[in-house]
C-alpha cells in the first residue's frame, strides 16, 4: 500500500465508530485545511503545532444516506466531467465546460484530472485569473490541460520522484509521495484522491497548477532580489549545477537576507573557497520538499553534508527552529525554491569561536575579553574546550586576569580534534603548552577533571566540545596529592608500611579509593603494629584501594554498577547516584581529584575484599572493627597471598632486534621472546593483575585483552642507545592487536570489556624484582608474548 | 543597463553641510544597497558607509560616524548622503555606488565634487 | 594613511604582465576577501575582482586576482594601453569595522 493508502486506512480506523466507511479528518484551527489523521497527528492532536478539530466525513468514493449511520452507499461513478461536480470542483467543472473541454473529458478515453478545488481557484492571482477567462479557447484550456494526464493513475500509482508529461506539451507534473501520507503535484496537495471515473480518475488538489518552464537557475537569473544569493552561487561555482536535471529544493536567502549578515562575517566567508561553497551547499537539499508536505519537524540532509531542521508553525515554515520562510512552492523543472529572510550558515562555514552556544557565552566572551581571541586564525586549526556557563563560579570570573587566561589557555588545544578523534589515553597539548589526558569510558569522554556534555561540532577552523567544568590539569602524583592532605596521614604510613610508597609515586594510570583518617577511628598503636607486623594482609588490603586506569566518577553511567579489579585482585564495585560516587555501596566524601598518575575518591571506611578470608582473630577483630559494611569471613590458618612488587622507573628503551616477529602460546616455566624487525621503539610500563606484573606494549587505539595466569619467565632482550620522538613515533604507528596469557588449568576467562579497556593505560616501563627488595640496575625491558 | 547619476558640484564654506543625490535606473532600487566611496584630490579611496534601499539600515565608517547622513527615497529611487560639520579636508569627489555585499561596488555613479573652502 | 600597502607604481610593455601587489594584516585580508577596483583617468572607479578571484561580467580574462595570507595580487597579462589606470585593492577590516582600500598602484604601459 502507498502512504497515502495508509494514512486513509488510519483515519478510517479512528471513524468507525461514527458508522461504515467513516473518515476521520483533522482540521488546523482557524484555516479551511484538512488532512486524512495520521497515527502521529492523531495523538498529538495537532499540525504543525496548531491544534486541530477532528471531523468526521465520508471516506472517498462513499456518501451518505438518509437515516443511516456513516456512509453505507457507495458514490455514484460517471465520467470524468461528471465527477469533477461529484467532488464538489465545480469552478473547474464549469471552465471545462466554457474551454471546450468537457466533450474530451466526456467520451471515451482514460485520464486522470489534478482538478483544483473552488477555493484553490479563488486563491489563485486574480490577473491571471482573469487572463485565463478572458481566452478560453487557448489560454484557459492549455492550463486545464496542463492538469491531466493521458492515463488512469491512483494514489499508488503516483510514486515519488516521478515526473509525468501532462496533456499539454507534455510539460512534466512533478510527484511527491511522502512517508505522511502528503501527495503532491508540483506541490499542489491531493485533498481528495482517487475518485473513480468511468473514463479516468479525478483528484481534487488545494492550488491551481502553473506552468513550469524554468530551472532554478533561471529563476536566480531573472530574479534582481535574488542577487546576492546568485552572485555567491557564481562564485561558488553552484550556478550551473541548479540548471542540471534534479529534484532540488532551494532555500534561497533574498538580499535582505544577505543584510542582515554582519558585513565582516560575510566578507571572510565570500573571501573563503571552502567556507562561501559550505555556505551555499547548506541551502541545498537533493530531495524535492513542498512545504504541503511539512506537518511537522523533520530533519534533511542539506548538499552540504551537515543536516537542516525543517518545520512548520500553523501556515509559516521554520528552518532550524526559526520562522523564516517568506515565499513558499516556487516550482521549477529541476526543483522547488522557497524564499527564506535569513541566510544559514554551516557550522563548517564558521569561525571555531563562533561554534559556541548560549550555553558557553561566559568562555566565548572571556575569550575575547583576554586577547585569546585574536590568536585563533582564520587559516589556523584549533579546539576549544568549552566549559558551560555554570562552570564559571564568581571566584573564578574575579580571579586575577593573568590567572585567568591561564587558565583559559588550559581550554584551546593547537590542533583540530573531532568527537571521533578522540581516544583513551591520548594526550592533547593546550596553546599555553600543558598536556591534558582524555579517558573514554562507556557513555562518556573526559579531559582531566571535565566530562563532555552532548554538543560537539567542527567549523572551519577548528572544533568545540562542551565540558561541564572547567578543566584543570593535574600538578602533583598520587603520593604528593596525600602527602599534602592531613586526612590520609595514617593511610600514607600503612602504606609507606608495606612498601608502596614508588606505586603511587612514579607515572602510571590508577584509581585510588582513599580512606580518611576517620576510617581508622579506634585503632590502637597495638593494633596498628598488628597490622603493619602482616605484611602480606596490609598490602592485600592497601592494593584492594587500588585499581589500574584512571576511572572519573563523572565518566559512569548513572545508577549502574561497574565491576573493575583491582591490583589486589578482588573485584571493586562502583556507582554514579545523584552526583555520587558509590564504591561498594559506600559514598565516597569527595571524588574525581586529579593527579598526574591518576585520580583519588575520598572514602572514610576502609575497604575490603569480601572474597579473601581472614585466618587470625586478632586480625579479624581488628578489621571488624573497622569495617562494618560487609560480614569478613573467617577461616583458621588462612594466610593472605603475597604479592609481588614492582618498581616503576619512567624509561624507554630502544631495541634493535633483526627477525620476523614470533607469537606463541606461553606455558609456566617457559621462555617468551619476542623479535622484531628494523628499529622500533617501545613505550612498556607494568600492570599487577591477579599479583602478577603483566608487562605491556602501549597501543592507544585499540582494545587490548589479557588473560591473567600463573607467573611467567621472560626473556629480555635490550640494547643501549637514545631514542628520538620520530622513531617512537614510527613505532608506535605498528599495530599489537591482542595481549594475551596463557592460564594453566585456568577458567581463561576473559575481563569484561569495560574492564580491559582500562587494564592497557599506562607509560612506564618496569622489571620484576623479588617483593620488598629495590634494585638499582641497568635499564631492562621485557617483552610478553603475544597471540595475534 | 544599470546607471548611477549623481548630482552636481557643491562648494560649501567649514562648518556647513551638504547632502549630495543619487538616482538609480536600470534595476530593482529596493533590492540593492549603496555605499559611498569618496576621494580626496590626488589621494586614494575611502569607504563612508553603507545603507540597504530595502530596509533603511545603515553602517557608517566610525570615522565619520555622527557627521554622516545616508538615506534613501524607493519611490524615485534615488540615495542622499549628508555631510555635516565639513571640514577643508572633507573636500573631495564623492561617489555612490551600488552594492550588494556579496558583490561590492559594481556599478559606481559619475562623482560629485564637493569643495570645502572659506 | 591606507590600511592596505600597495607598491606606488608598476610598468610594463604592450603584451608583458604586470602584477599589483597589496600587502595587509590579519585583521582584513588575513580573515576577509580582497577586491580589487580600477580607475581610469578622470573616471569613477570599476569593479575588476571581486573575492579574491572572481571577474564580473564584462571584465576580460588577462585580469585576475590571488590572496595568499595576508596578502593579495592582481595580475594584468597581455598589457594593453587601455589598461594604464589606477588599480586599487580592498577588503574589509575587521578590528576597525570599515572597508579598506590600499593606496592605489598606478599602472603604466610603456
Known amino acids: 500500500n502507498s502512504y497515502y493508502d495508509k494514512v486513509l486506512a488510519h483515519s478510517r480506523i479512528r471513524g468507525r465508530d461514527q458508522g461504515p466507511n467513516v473518515c476521520a479528518l483533522q482540521q488546523i484551527l482557524g484555516t479551511k485545511k484538512k488532512y486524512f489523521s495520521s497515527c502521529k497527528n492523531w495523538y498529538q492532536g495537532a499540525i504543525c503545532g496548531k491544534k486541530t478539530t477532528v471531523l468526521y466525513e465520508c471516506c472517498p468514493g462513499y456518501m451518505r444516506m438518509e437515516g443511516m449511520k456513516g456512509c453505507p452507499a457507495v458514490m455514484p461513478i460517471d465520467h470524468v466531467y461528471g465527477t469533477l461536480g461529484i467532488v464538489g470542483a465545480t469552478t473547474t467543472q464549469h471552465y471545462s465546460d466554457v474551454s471546450k473541454l468537457r466533450e474530451e473529458i466526456e467520451g471515451k478515453g482514460s485520464y486522470t484530472y489534478f482538478a483544483p478545488s473552488n477555493e484553490a481557484w479563488e486563491n489563485l492571482d486574480s490577473d491571471i485569473r482573469r487572463g485565463l477567462e478572458n481566452n478560453v479557447n487557448v489560454e484557459l484550456l492549455n492550463a486545464l490541460h496542463s492538469h491531466m494526464v493521458n492515463k488512469r493513475m491512483l494514489t499508488k500509482d503516483l510514486k515519488h520522484g516521478m515526473v509525468i508529461p501532462s496533456m499539454y506539451n507534455n510539460l512534466g507534473l512533478f510527484i511527491n509521495h511522502y512517508p505522511n501520507g502528503v501527495v503532491t503535484v508540483n506541490c499542489a496537495r491531493v485533498i481528495h484522491g482517487n475518485q473513480i471515473a468511468t473514463n479516468g480518475v479525478v483528484h481534487v488538489i488545494d492550488r491551481v497548477l502553473t506552468q513550469i518552464g524554468t530551472s532554478i537557475q533561471d529563476f536566480l537569473e531573472a530574479e534582481d532580489d535574488l542577487s546576492s544569493f546568485r552572485a555567491a552561487a557564481i562564485t561558488s561555482d553552484l550556478l550551473e549545477s541548479l540548471g542540471r536535471d534534479g529534484h532540488f529544493t532551494l532555500f534561497a536567502p533574498t538580499n535582505e537576507a544577505f543584510e542582515k549578515l554582519p558585513r565582516g562575517v560575510l566578507e571572510r566567508i565570500m573571501g573563503d573557497k571552502v567556507a562561501s561553497e559550505a555556505l551555499m551547499k547548506y541551502h541545498i537539499l537533493n530531495t524535492l520538499q513542498c512545504s504541503e508536505a511539512i506537518t511537522g519537524g523533520a530533519v534533511f540532509e542539506t548538499m552540504e553534508g551537515n543536516t537542516i531542521e525543517i518545520g512548520c508553525e500553523g501556515d509559516s515554515i521554520s528552518i532550524n527552529g526559526i520562522k523564516m520562510v517568506n515565499k513558499k512552492d516556487i516550482v521549477t523543472k529541476n526543483g522547488v525554491i522557497h524564499l527564506i529572510d535569513e541566510v544559514l550558515i554551516p557550522d563548517s562555514a564558521k569561525q571555531v569561536i563562533e561554534l559556541a552556544g548560549k550555553q558557553q557565552t561566559t568562555f566565548t566572551d572571556l575569550v575575547a575579553q583576554l586577547g585569546l581571541a585574536s590568536s585563533l586564525k582564520p587559516d589556523g586549526e584549533y579546539t576549544l574546550l568549552a566549559p558551560v556557563n555554570n562552570a564559571f563560579s564568581d571566584d573564578t570570573l574575579s580571579m586575577d586576569q593573568r590567572l585567568l587566561k591561564l587558565i583559559l589557555q588550559n581550554h584551546i588545544l593547537k590542533v583540530k580534534v573531532g568527537l571521533s578523534d578522540l581516544y583513551n589515553g591520548q594526550i592533547l597539548e593546550t596553546i599555553g603548552g600543558k598536556q591534558l589526558r582524555v579517558f573514554v569510558y562507556r557513555t562518556a569522554i573526559c579531559i582531566e577533571n571535565s566530562c563532555m556534555v552532548r554538543g560537539s561540532k567542527q567549523g572551519r577552523n577548528g572544533a568545540i566540545h562542551i565540558f561541564r567544568e572547567i578543566i584543570q590539569p593535574a600538578e602533583k602524583s598520587l603520593h604528593d596529592k596525600l602527602r599534602q592532605d592531613k586526612r590520609f596521614s595514617i593511610f600514607l604510613s600503612l602504606l609507606e608500611a608495606a612498601d608502596l610508597k614508588d606505586l603511587l609515586t612514579q607515572p602510571g594510570d590508577w584509581t585510588l579509593f582513599a580512606p580518611t583518617n576517620d576510617a581508622f577511628k579506634g585503632m590502637t598503636s597495638e593494633e596498628r603494629e598488628l597490622l603493619i607486623g602482616d605484611k602480606n594482609a596490609l598490602q592485600n588490603i592497601i592494593l584492594y584501594h587500588l585499581t589500574p586506569g584512571v576511572y572519573i566518577g563523572k565518566g559512569f553511567e548513572p545508577g549502574v554498577t561497574n565491576i573493575l579489579k583491582t591490583t589486589q585482585g578482588s573485584k571493586i564495585y562502583l556507582k554514579g547516584v545523584n552526583e555520587t560516587l558509590l564504591v561498594n555501596e559506600l559514598k565516597s566524601k569527595e571524588s574525581d581529584i586529579m593527579t598526574t598518575n591518576g585520580v583519588i575518591h575520598v572514602v572514610d571506611k576502609l575497604l575490603y575484599p569480601a572474597d579473601i578470608p581472614v585466618g587470625n582473630d586478632q586480625l579479624l577483630e581488628l578489621l571488624n572493627k573497622l569495617i562494618k559494611y560487609i560480614q569478613i569471613k573467617f577461616v583458621r590458618g588462612s594466610t593472605f597471598k603475597e604479592i609481588p612488587m614492582t618498581v616503576y622507573r619512567p624509561a624507554m628503551t630502544k631495541i634493535q632486534i633483526e627477525g620476523d616477529p614470533d607469537f606463541r602460546l606461553i606455558k609456566e616455566g617457559e621462555t617468551v621472546t619476542e623479535v622484531i624487525h628494523g628499529e622500533p621503539v617501545i613505550k612498556k610500563y607494568t600492570k599487577i593483575i591477579d599479583g602478577v606484573p603483566v608487562e605491556i606494549t602501549e597501543k592507544q587505539t585499540r582494545e587490548e585483552r589479557i588473560i591473567t595466569g600463573p607467573e611467567i619467565k621472560y626473556t629480555r632482550i635490550s640494547t643501549g642507545g637514545g631514542e628520538t620522538g620520530e622513531t617512537l613515533q614510527k613505532f608506535l604507528q605498528k599495530e599489537v592487536s591482542k595481549v594475551t596469557k596463557f592460564i594453566e588449568g585456568g577458567d581463561g576467562h576473559l575481563f569484561e570489556d569495560e574492564e580491559i579497556k582500562r587494564l592497557l593505560q599506562g607509560d612506564t616501563p618496569a622489571k620484576k624484582i623479588p617483593a620488598n627488595k629495590r634494585v638499582q640496575g641497568p635499564r631492562r625491558r621485557s617483552r610478553e608474548g603475544r597471540s595475534q | 543597463q544599470v546607471q548611477l547619476v549623481q548630482s552636481g558640484a557643491e562648494v560649501k564654506k567649514p562648518g556647513a553641510s551638504v547632502k549630495v543625490s543619487c538616482k538609480a535606473s536600470?534595476?530593482?532600487?529596493?533590492?540593492?544597497?549603496i555605499s559611498w566611496v569618496r576621494q580626496a584630490p590626488g589621494q586614494g579611496l575611502e569607504w563612508m558607509g553603507w545603507?540597504?534601499?530595502?530596509?533603511?539600515?545603515?553602517n557608517y565608517a566610525q570615522k565619520l560616524q555622527g557627521r554622516v547622513t545616508m538615506t534613501t527615497d524607493t519611490s524615485t529611487s534615488t540615495a542622499y548622503m549628508e555631510l555635516r560639520s565639513l571640514r577643508s579636508d572633507d573636500t573631495a569627489v564623492y561617489y555612490c555606488?551600488?552594492?550588494?555585499?556579496?558583490?561590492?561596488?559594481?556599478?559606481w555613479g559619475q562623482g560629485t565634487l564637493v569643495t570645502v573652502s572659506s | 594613511q591606507s590600511v592596505l600597502t600597495q607598491s606606488s607604481s608598476a610598468s610594463g610593455t604592450p603584451g608583458q604582465t604586470v602584477t599589483v601587489s597589496c600587502s595587509g594584516s590579519?585583521?582584513?585580508?588575513?580573515?576577509?576577501?580582497v577586491n580589487w577596483y580600477q580607475q581610469l583617468p578622470g573616471t569613477a572607479p570599476k569593479l575588476l575582482i571581486y573575492?579574491?578571484?572572481q571577474r564580473p561580467s564584462g571584465v576580460p580574462d588577462r585580469f585576475s586576482g590571488s590572496k595568499s595570507g595576508t596578502s593579495a595580487s592582481l595580475a594584468i597579462s597581455g598589457l594593453q594601453s587601455a589598461d594604464e589606470a589606477d588599480y586599487y585593492c580592498a577588503a574589509w577590516d575587521d578590528s576597525l569595522s570599515t572597508y579598506v582600500f590600499g593606496s592605489g598602484t598606478k599602472v603604466t604601459v610603456l
Open positions: 573575492s579574491n578571484d
Open positions: 545603507i540597504s534601499a530595502y530596509s533603511g539600515n545603515t
Open positions: 590579519s585583521s582584513d585580508i588575513g580573515s576577509n576577501r
Open positions: 555606488a551600488r552594492d550588494i555585499l556579496v558583490v561590492p561596488f559594481d556599478y
Open positions: 536600470g534595476y530593482t532600487f529596493t533590492s540593492y544597497g
